[in-house]
């Protein structure tokens, strides 16, 4: 969900003007700028399909469009996982798949998408207006969730087009670790750009339509990303956006199995849309990550020696080794 802002094309100086060192120092800002642009805008899509053959059978597909590594996917129905929803399946990239009736078959389709077949009869049977949610816990983005359901008029065999992230939630995990490094890089980048502005401008290529111009524009940060550059370090994106089914592929587009969400151009958020929180104490990154697993009834992945995976009445020494073997 990246919006592209028109910013003046920053063109690098001609080779030889500032020498090899000058050229190298200008490569770094571009790399950092790219990281800043791509780091902050993951997206989750959800697609729900009722099977034509069995009216009580649904297929849910979810995907994560982000650069982070996925550590857990939770699929729930009846609402988001932490807000009254019931977990249907938990997919861990390393440990396997834990699923609850009426989930019949959950699978990884790719490294960033999953599918789940639901088959119900009686009380546990899904109905046409059920909301299905997918929550992706990833590093460094944090936890991102999207929900979708069949449109009321859906015929069996048709599907709702992919819903691009109606609910977006980045937990504290997403602003620590690598994000910290990126933010530091972004600050450093601004510093470099400011220095560059105050320096006597080197002779740039005069033509605005030079080959570098479109390339420079492609590097340009979105307004949302730019806003992120101006907010204090400890910010979390807690924006909730309504479902934008109309922005996805229309029914006349490619088949549902192959379809992917379009990048809907949402209004960029200004700093006011970001919630600022104090920087947590050292170690709370692990507890936040573990909270994601606890919500799904799961254990977090190995978090290193000496870290208790669940609260233990016997204190921090109660858990040592892979299974807490003493």
């Amino acid at each position: 969900m990246r919006t592209e802002a028109q910013v003046p094309a920053l063109q690098p100086p001609e080779p030889g003007l500032e020498g090899a060192m000058g050229h190298r120092t200008l490569v770094l800002p571009w790399v950092l700028l790219t990281l800043c642009v791509t780091a902050g805008t993951p997206e989750v899509w959800v697609q729900v399909r009722m099977e034509a053959t069995e009216l009580s059978s649904f297929t849910i597909r979810c995907g994560f469009l982000g650069s982070g590594s996925i550590s857990l996917v939770t699929v729930s129905w009846g609402g988001p996982n932490g807000a009254g929803g019931t977990t249907l399946a938990v997919l861990h990239p390393e440990r396997g798949i834990r699923q609850w009736a009426p989930a019949r078959q959950a699978r990884w389709e790719t490294q960033s998408s999953i599918s789940l077949i639901l088959e119900g009869s009686g009380a546990s049977s899904p109905c046409a207006n059920t909301t299905f949610c997918c929550k992706f816990a990833s590093f460094p983005e944090g936890s991102w969730e999207a929900c979708g359901s069949l449109p009321p008029s859906s015929d069996p065999g048709l599907s709702a087009p992919p819903t691009p992230a109606p609910i977006l939630r980045a937990d504290l995990a997403g602003i620590l670790g690598v994000s910290g490094v990126l933010l530091f890089g972004c600050v450093y980048l601004l510093h470099l750009l400011r220095r560059h502005k105050h320096r006597p401008a080197p002779r740039l290529q005069p033509s605005r339509t030079s080959p570098q111009a479109p390339r420079a524009r492609a590097w340009a940060p979105s307004q949302a990303s730019q806003a992120a550059l101006h907010v204090p370090y400890a910010t979390i994106n807690t924006s909730c956006r309504p479902a934008t089914l109309d922005t996805a592929h229309p029914h006349g587009g490619p088949s549902w199995w192959a379809s992917l969400p379009t990048h809907a151009a949402h209004r960029p958020q200004g700093p006011a849309a970001w919630a600022s929180t104090p920087i947590p104490a050292r170690g709370s990154f692990v507890s936040v990550e573990n909270g994601l697993y606890a919500q799904a009834g799961e254990r977090p992945p190995h978090t290193g020696p000496g870290l208790t995976l669940f609260p233990d009445p016997r204190g921090p020494r109660a858990m040592e080794g892979p299974l807490g073997v003493r």
């Epitope: 996925i70 861990h92 990239p93 390393e94 440990r95 396997g96 798949i97 834990r98 699923q99 609850w100 989930a103 078959q105 959950a106 699978r107 990884w108 389709e109 790719t110 490294q111 606890a294 009834g297 254990r299 190995h302 208790t308 995976l309 669940f310 609260p311 233990d312 016997r314 109660a318 858990m319 892979p322 299974l323 807490g324 073997v325 003493r326």
Partner: antibody
Framework: QVQLQQPGAELVKPGASVKLSCKAS????????MHWVKQRPGQGLEWIGE????????NYNEKFKSKATLTVDHSSSTAYMQLSSLTSEDSAVYYC?????????????WGQGTSVTVSS | DIVMTQSPSSLAMSVGQKVTMSCKSS????????????LAWYQQKPGQSPKLLVY???TRDSGVPDRFIGSGSGTDFTLTISSVQAEDLADYFC?????????FGGGTKLEIK
């Protein structure tokens, strides 16, 4: 070392219920889901269900949903499985098993099993 | 549920011989996220509880002799005992640990001649 202790045998009448126990030691009880597995004489293994001792959350094989109820007692680090409305089909050895965090459904540590005989 | 089928149901071998037993699953056990196969092998000696030998199709559990070799991918898997020993007399079960509910094969009984 990890140990799962189960009583050796239970003799129960048809139609009655039995509550099997599995006492865990040598690891943090809340850190691993506890599984229960059925083995009828000379036959294969069937997974009954699992319970997360940290929050009591359960997950059952559909086949055993109305037969088995899984619970835990934190104070004694013990997992329980209650089997109801017993018939001769329920005569089997029942194992508890826990895993070492590598995969959800590898059963790394097993109890010795409780032999349940349903007979009048 | 994923159905696991083992063959042969029994076999008799002499000490030192190479043993292979097969396990087939009704659907692929390959996790497309990490290209791992979620299949385990267990050994159950007479009067004992099962013991984990191999998981992720080919990873030996700690303390398991290296004569036990797991292989295969997708739906077809094999457990090989490169040089069978008298203490290997047991039932061997394969199990998919891909998803709920985990399911076991019917077992292969290994007898020593």
């Amino acid at each position: 070392q990890v140990q799962l202790q189960q009583p050796g045998a239970e003799l129960v009448k048809p139609g009655a219920s039995v509550k099997l126990s599995c006492k865990a030691s040598g690891y943090t009880f809340t850190s691993s889901w506890m599984h229960w597995v059925k083995q009828r004489p000379g036959q294969g293994l069937e997974w009954i269900g699992e319970i997360n001792p940290s929050d009591g959350r359960t997950n059952y094989n559909e086949k055993f949903k109305s037969k088995a109820t899984l619970t835990v007692d934190h104070s004694s680090s013990t997992a329980y499985m209650q089997l109801s409305s017993l018939t001769s089909e329920d005569s089997a050895v029942y194992y508890c098993a826990s895993n070492a965090d590598r995969a959800y459904y590898t059963m790394d540590y097993w109890g010795q099993g409780t032999s349940v005989t349903v007979s009048s | 549920d994923i159905v696991m089928t083992q063959s042969p149901s029994s076999l008799a071998m002499s000490v030192g011989q190479k043993v292979t037993m097969s396990c087939k699953s009704s659907q692929s056990l390959l996790n497309s996220f990490n290209q791992r196969n979620f299949l385990a092998w267990y050994q159950q000696k007479p009067g004992q509880s099962p013991k984990l030998l191999v998981y992720f199709a080919s990873t030996r559990d700690s303390g398991v002799p290296d004569r036990f070799i797991g292989s295969g991918s997708g739906t077809d898997f094999t457990l090989t005992i490169s040089s069978v020993q008298a203490e290997d007399l047991a039932d061997y079960f394969c199990q998919q640990h891909y998803s709920t509910p985990p399911t076991f094969g019917g077992g292969t009984k290994l007898e020593i001649k």
